[in-house]
């Protein structure tokens, strides 16, 4: 039903979900602090404008009495017992941040009357795709099986001059959130790249996966992973890989690659690792400081969604526009708005664009290195490293497909 | 970064025993490997042995059958169990990790064999 929104005569609220089952196990004070930090900063940037307004937040907790599972398996209802909780208590805000969980957005979106924008820090199924109200400030799984398939497809580059068309999938169900949600949507029948793609098998067991590194009758050369180096040496070990195997290993949350003093280990170097471009400062930032590598994202996706916020409000007060209207709630899309650490794109569909990047592991220096980068807003692959000094031979990467000569 | 201390080194015998020691201030478990190295003077460093945390260990040539790697889960702590020690084994040992994202080295303890 319809809920009062405290959002108007100079004084603007934001309802925070504050759930226990989240895309990250990330200290729900952690999360505040990020929030706070984004209101400091937007009421410095509204008063600034000459908009002489209030802008709070008020964290909803869930009880965790029934709800604890702590991920985002029992989600669902959370967030639909938070709603219910704002709804009695009359306290709902302008704009809605949270939930991060897929089931819980879907749920939420599915099941409630959205005159208001909804912001998530996660939200990355494909159930969540083209959602007029919501807003996704972390790469959702589209965005990646559209860079798979771009570059499944390159095949003028000096380092891959051939066109991809199979893949393995490994996916063995004890993926975080992000990863569970990504790796769904390769395996989806009716997904983008199942469509693009000839092949495509999706392995299960550790054993399975193990077997495929020196199996001799294997159907393609590329197996799709995701998680960090160490989640790739627990299932690989010491593991001898034929040397036409490339693994691409999907990290997107994991600054650390860019870090200094970072050196690969061995099992590295017939592995690209698939991570987001890390911000211009934030890995020195007093923000970022307290957060792992892995957590950074998330705690900024909160604090952006804050100034997402802070933007749209000063635009519609500049505007002389009501904030409590659908044309508010639909209209947090096809923007850039200035986040924490630069600007921040948002397409037509509410979901963040991003550069994703592409590493190798010189045989050389036993460095990470930047093959590729891959801007999602636009679709393009654009070559970082024309010469680089893979373990693959003549430093190309190989067919997909052993034994097939060029297409 | 992980921090690593040696000690057992010291002055020895030709056909004599050392037993070095390497205290590591994490779980060693969850590190990649954990390696021995040794620098002669005026010589590169050069891998001794070296042990992954899936178990596999790889020696120097010169040293196979004489060194052995090994492991205290509980100490956290590694060995390098050297005997049949030559003159050029003589160096300064160092122990070597790497967490799966950087190196990281101890100071380095002396081994002399001499008569």
């Known amino acids: 039903s319809q809920v009062s929104q405290n959002c108007h005569n100079g004084s603007y609220e934001i309802s925070v979900l504050m759930m226990g089952n989240s895309a990250f196990a990330e200290p729900l004070k952690n999360l505040e602090d990020a929030v706070n930090e984004g209101l400091e900063i937007v009421r410095g940037r509204l008063q600034n404008a000459g908009l002489n307004v209030t802008v709070n937040a008020t964290f909803m907790y869930s009880d965790g009495l029934i709800h604890n599972s702590g991920d985002c398996r029992s989600s669902t209802c959370e967030g639909l017992d938070l709603l219910r909780k704002i709804s009695n208590a009359q306290r709902m805000g302008c704009v809605l941040i949270g939930p991060s969980c897929t089931y819980s957005t879907f749920q939420m979106y599915l099941d409630t009357e959205l005159s208001y924008p909804m912001i998530s820090a996660g939200s990355f199924g494909l159930s969540c795709d083209y959602k007029e109200t919501l807003t996704r400030l972390m790469s959702p799984a589209r965005k990646l099986m559209y860079f798979l398939v771009n570059f499944w497809k390159t095949n003028d580059l000096p380092f891959k001059t051939y066109s991809w068309s199979t893949s393995y999938v490994y996916k063995n169900g004890t993926e975080t959130e992000d990863c569970f949600w990504y790796l769904n949507a390769l395996e989806a029948s009716v997904s983008y790249f199942s469509h693009e793609l000839g092949f495509k098998v999706v392995l299960r067991q550790d054993k399975e996966f193990q077997d495929i590194l020196m199996d001799h009758n294997r159907k393609s050369n590329v197996i799709i992973m995701c998680g960090g180096p160490e989640f790739l040496y627990k299932l690989k070990g010491d593991r001898a890989v034929a040397e036409d195997i490339v693994i691409i290993l999907v990290d997107l949350f994991n600054d650390q690659y860019f870090e200094d003093n970072v050196t690969a280990p061995d099992y590295m170097k017939n592995v690209l690792v698939l991570t987001l471009s890390p911000g211009n400062s934030l890995l020195n930032s007093s923000f970022s400081r307290n957060l792992s590598p892995t957590k950074r994202d998330f705690a900024l996706a909160y604090l952006n969604g804050i100034l997402l916020f802070g933007h749209m409000l000063k635009i519609f007060l500049e505007n002389g526009e009501n904030i409590t209207t659908p044309k508010f709630a639909h209209a947090f899309r096809n923007l850039t708005f200035e986040g924490y650490d630069g600007p921040v794109t948002l397409d037509d569909w509410g979901d963040v664009d991003s550069t994703m990047v592409l590493l190798y592991t010189s045989v050389d220096t036993k460095k990470y290195k930047v093959l590729l980068t891959y801007d999602t807003h636009v679709n393009k692959t654009y070559p970082v490293d024309m010469s680089p000094t893979f373990t693959w031979k003549n430093s190309k990467l190989p067919n997909d497909i052993t034994g097939r000569g060029p297409q | 970064q992980v921090q690593l201390v040696e000690s057992g080194g010291g002055l020895v015998q030709p056909g004599g025993s050392l037993r070095l020691s390497c205290a590591v201030s994490r779980n060693i478990a969850s590190l990649y490997r954990v390696d021995w190295y040794r620098q002669a003077p005026g010589k590169q460093r050069e891998l001794v042995a070296g042990?992954?945390?899936?178990?596999?260990?790889t020696y120097l040539d010169a040293v196979e059958g004489r060194f052995t790697i090994s492991r205290d889960n509980v100490k956290d702590t590694v060995y390098l169990q050297m005997n049949s020690l030559t003159p050029e084994d003589t160096a300064v040992y160092y122990c070597?990790?790497?967490?799966?994202?950087?190196?990281?080295w101890g100071q380095g303890t002396q081994v002399t064999v001499s008569s």
């Open positions: 070597h990790a790497h967490d799966h994202w950087r190196d990281s």
């Open positions: 042990r992954t945390s899936g178990g596999t260990t």
